[in-house]
Interface confidence: low
């Protein structure tokens, strides 16, 4: 198809080197068609005209994503030639960052439905740039979190360094969706709900004496709990005896409970005691259970191909550890009678 | 990943200490060993310290090596090296796999100590 | 301490071709046994645990059999890169019997 008659957008991607960051392009296609078709209005309901000249499809996934390449080649379809470059409804998700994504994205709809449809595409030139050491050396992280029940704030990673006087109109958007009310360089919010969680989009800005660019920056935010004050607990094994048939396989499993931590470093290991001897045992690896906002369970299991006489005279101890400090149980094998 | 230093010529009756330098490894969950070899000879297990910071020695190496470690560094401290001390001494992480057995799974490229007068 | 006795000193074979290594123990060490293969400058590289387990990345060329005093490595289908001296070791977890390795077996492919 043809894309001279595509609208065109400057984008740039300054990545720090430092942090994994993601990316994120939006079909930004002309208003009206926007609304009717990704369902990002910008609009008002007032303002939503009567007859939408774009007649595309409600299915989110309809759009098309192509990349330009530089030596004139044909357009490449997305997603048969990026695989870290992922398609979500009408959103472009770059996973990693790098100068190899510099290029030109063009979107447009699969169903060309009526005359008005041709030229309904929108084309991306995007410049993706390291960024400098001369930048501020103390910008925002590209993950944030905010604490639940308390006041916080979300800054754009590419203008937290300037102060709020200085700094341009910013347009932010949320999981997609424009927050219209927002323009400075930092959401404030009053009290933080689960629901504040999500992908956060800031986009401002930038001209020069030839052309303007809009500078983008993502920002994953986290809705997260305080972190605990309280060791880990062991849930299993609760008794400290437990009966075995010798010459039989065992395993034996360790699951503990650890409260949430910003800083989350668990450790749960078994090791045996015999007489004078301890011992570690380190396999099988440990396994995240069931994971919330609030706590995770891990379970880390020791296996015996077969239990022998002298497995009874040793102790085996799940040992669980946090920040705050750890948490031992001990099993002893006995022999099943009868 | 896993490595020695501090091998050098060194005169019988002198003391040597060898560093095993680890990184990506938590000496709070693994056990380290060191194991030499002479020239031209097999290898021989001198001792392991366990996570938890206990060591074992093989029964000719008692009293003669010292294993001692930080969060980060295992050494072994040879206390009056003989002619016979001569060997790449080799640091290896010990793990203890499934069925209760331990052995070597990670091994660092050795450090050579030469004692000679 | 368990003393590990390895037989023979050397074994040569031809490409393709197979060959047994022997470990004796001087007590029973019920599976507790690895076996390591060391070429020329290099540390040594574990191939089997618990007697006959398959170490991660290894070839199953590589077999292990045996309990209690007598062990064995075979190596079938045997290649250029397989020539090494190759060691057993005791593995019994137990505060005298810790460590010991067996002489060393030279295999030779010809």
């Known amino acids: 198809f043809n894309i001279s008659g595509c609208s065109t957008k400057k984008l740039l991607w300054t990545y720090s080197t430092r942090s994994e960051e993601e990316f994120v392009l939006f079909c930004d296609l002309p208003e009206p068609q926007k609304s009717h078709f990704c369902h990002r209005n910008r609009l008002s309901p007032k303002q939503v005209p009567e007859h939408l000249p774009f007649m595309g499809s409600n299915d989110l996934s309809d759009v098309q994503w192509y990349q330009q390449p530089s030596n004139g080649d044909p357009l490449e379809d997305i997603r048969k030639s990026y695989p870290h470059i992922i398609q979500d409804k009408c959103t472009l998700h770059f996973l990693t960052p790098g100068v190899n994504n510099s290029g030109s994205y063009i979107c447009r709809p699969k169903m060309i439905k009526s005359p008005y449809d041709v030229a309904c595409c929108v084309k991306m030139i995007l410049e993706v740039k390291p960024q400098t050491n001369a930048s501020c050396e103390y910008s925002a992280s590209h993950k944030q979190d905010l604490l639940l029940g308390s006041t916080g704030s979300i800054s754009c990673p590419s203008l937290s360094c300037q102060s709020d006087a200085q700094s341009p109109a910013v347009t932010w958007y949320k999981n997609g969706k424009l927050l219209s009310v927002e323009r400075s360089n930092r959401i404030v919010v009053d009290e933080v709900y689960d629901y504040h969680q999500g992908t956060y989009v800031c986009d401002y800005t930038q001209s020069d004496t030839v052309s303007s660019w809009t500078v983008r920056a993502v920002v994953q935010v986290r809705t997260i709990v305080g972190d605990t004050k309280l060791k880990p607990d062991i849930l299993d094994p609760v008794e400290d005896t437990l009966e075995v048939e010798l010459g039989k396989p065992l395993t034996i499993s360790c699951k503990a409970r650890f409260g949430f931590e910003r800083v989350f470093n668990p450790v749960i290991k078994w090791y045996i005691k015999d007489s004078d001897l301890e011992w570690e045992v380190s396999v099988p690896e440990a396994k995240s259970i069931k994971s919330t906002l609030k706590d995770e369970i891990i379970e880390r299991n020791i296996i015996l191909e077969k239990v022998t006489q002298r497995d009874l005279r040793r102790k085996f101890v799940c040992f669980v550890q946090n920040s705050i400090g750890n948490t031992t149980q001990s099993v002893q094998l006995k022999e099943k009678r009868g | 990943s896993v490595e020695e230093s501090g091998g050098r010529l060194v005169t019988p009756g002198g003391s040597l200490t060898l560093t095993c330098t680890v990184s990506?490894?938590?000496?709070?969950?693994?056990?380290m060993s060191w194991v030499r070899q002479a020239p031209g000879k097999g290898l021989e297990w001198i001792g392991i310290i366990t996570f938890s910071g206990n060591t074992y020695y093989a029964s000719w190496a008692k009293g003669r090596f010292t294993i001692s470690k930080t969060s980060t560094t295992v050494d072994l401290k040879i206390t009056s090296p003989a002619t016979g001390d001569t060997a790449t001494y080799f640091c290896?992480?010990?793990?203890?796999?499934?069925?209760?057995?331990?052995?070597?799974?990670?091994w660092g490229p050795g450090t050579l100590v030469t004692v000679s007068s | 301490d368990v003393v590990m006795t390895q037989t023979p000193a050397s074994a040569s074979a031809a490409v393709g071709g197979t060959v047994t290594i022997n470990c004796q123990a001087s007590?029973?060490?019920?599976?507790?046994l690895a076996w390591y293969q060391q070429k020329p400058g290099q540390p040594p590289k574990l191939l089997i645990y618990s007697a006959s387990a398959l170490a991660s990345g290894v070839p199953s060329r590589f077999k292990g059999s045996g309990s209690g005093t007598e062990f064995a490595l075979t190596i079938s289908d045997l290649e250029c890169d397989d020539a090494a001296i190759y060691y057993c070791q005791c593995t019994f977890w137990d505060i005298n019997n810790f460590g010991g390795f067996g002489g060393g077996t030279e295999v030779v492919v010809k």
């Open positions: 007590e029973n060490i019920a599976n507790h």
């Open positions: 290896a992480r010990f793990d203890f796999l499934v069925g209760l057995t331990y052995a070597g799974v990670l």
């Open positions: 990506g490894i938590d000496l709070s969950v693994y056990a």
